[in-house]
């Protein structure tokens, strides 16, 4: 069964800056990745970035830089200033659309009482939805 993992990290240098990393553990080819916050995409969450393996990458404030790390993982850096900046208990979700598995999504947030610049190693987060 495919799994999606999500890792959220607060940057030590900028305490209101976050890095989200997500990965897909499956054999299919990924056709689209959507990163959202505040809940799953389409269920109250707000899209931060969309990554397509051939068409490109789109991102919207407060997202600063979205990138493909490997063929099955992505990262997103969030700016930490302004009214729309994330806070420590913000939930971030990643949805991977793949063929032939379909869509798989998982969410994560900053580990409780984590030190800035530190985070737990990425582990598969609960799969919230498989379309």
């Amino acid at each position: 069964t495919p799994e999606v993992w999500v890792q959220v990290r607060m940057e030590a240098t900028e305490l209101s800056s976050f890095t989200i990393r997500c990965g897909f553990l499956g054999s299919g080819s990924i056709s689209l990745v959507t990163v959202s916050w505040g809940g799953p995409n389409g269920a109250g969450g707000t899209t931060l970035a969309v990554l397509h393996p051939e068409r490109g990458i789109r991102q919207w404030a407060p997202a600063r830089q979205a990138r493909w790390e490997t063929q099955s993982s992505i990262s997103l850096i969030l700016e930490g200033s302004g009214a729309s900046s994330p806070c420590a208990n913000t939930t971030f979700c990643c949805k991977f659309a793949s063929f032939p598995e379909g869509s798989w999504e998982a969410c994560g947030s900053l580990p409780p009482s984590s030190d800035p610049g530190l985070s737990a190693p990425p582990t598969p987060a609960p799969i919230l939805r498989a379309d």
Epitope: T46, P53, E54, R55, A61, W68, Q71
Partner: antibody, heavy 114, light 113 residues
Framework: EVQLQQSGPELVKPGASVKISCKAS????????MNWVKQSHGKSLEWIGD????????SYNQKFKGKATLTVDQSSSTAYMELRSLTSEDSAVYYC???????WGQGTLVTVSA | DIVMTQSPSSLSVSAGEKVTMSCKSS????????????LAWYQQKPGQPPKLLIY???TRESGVPDRFTGSGSGTDFTLTISSVQAEDLAVYYC?????????FGSGTKLEIK
Amino acid sequence: EVQLQQSGPELVKPGASVKISCKASGYTFTDYSMNWVKQSHGKSLEWIGDINPDNGGTSYNQKFKGKATLTVDQSSSTAYMELRSLTSEDSAVYYCARIWFAYWGQGTLVTVSA
Amino acid sequence: DIVMTQSPSSLSVSAGEKVTMSCKSSQSLLNSGIQKNFLAWYQQKPGQPPKLLIYGASTRESGVPDRFTGSGSGTDFTLTISSVQAEDLAVYYCQNAHSYPFTFGSGTKLEIK
């Protein structure tokens, strides 16, 4: 069928503002961001910026910051671009295009003239 | 900003001939994480909006005839029309789809003899 229907041509005076629209149909408006592109007469294309209808989040080409403002109205599935402090340099055809530029509106001609 | 340079600025060919046009970017458009080039090609006929032909440097958009082929990697890209048809009269633009802002080339105007 995906369609992007833009508002009609505009003749405006220097220093004025203009707001042009792009009404989307044939898909879920909030699922896809909208780009805006400028094409001056006989010239190439310039990306102005894009807006995420889901939350109104925007990304702008620095060149057009302060010149263009992108907004959306989810209830009518319409994207808007307002251009302000217009000069003759702003005379152009302006296009809306859905994310990845696979679907384009027909264009809106803006002419700035006294 | 990434600068996209196209050549030639115009060319005139007879129907049935093979055509190639070049696009060079000032920075690499290769996404190293997935080894894909984020470059697109568009066709714009007179009085019409641009039409997406190629994305990912070499993938044809749905419905685009297979006489259109994109190739290249990094900073050097080519659009080839294997057998030009009269309806291919247009200006062809390449676009940086790698990083903001999404810059376009100045275009190659294709005329049919």
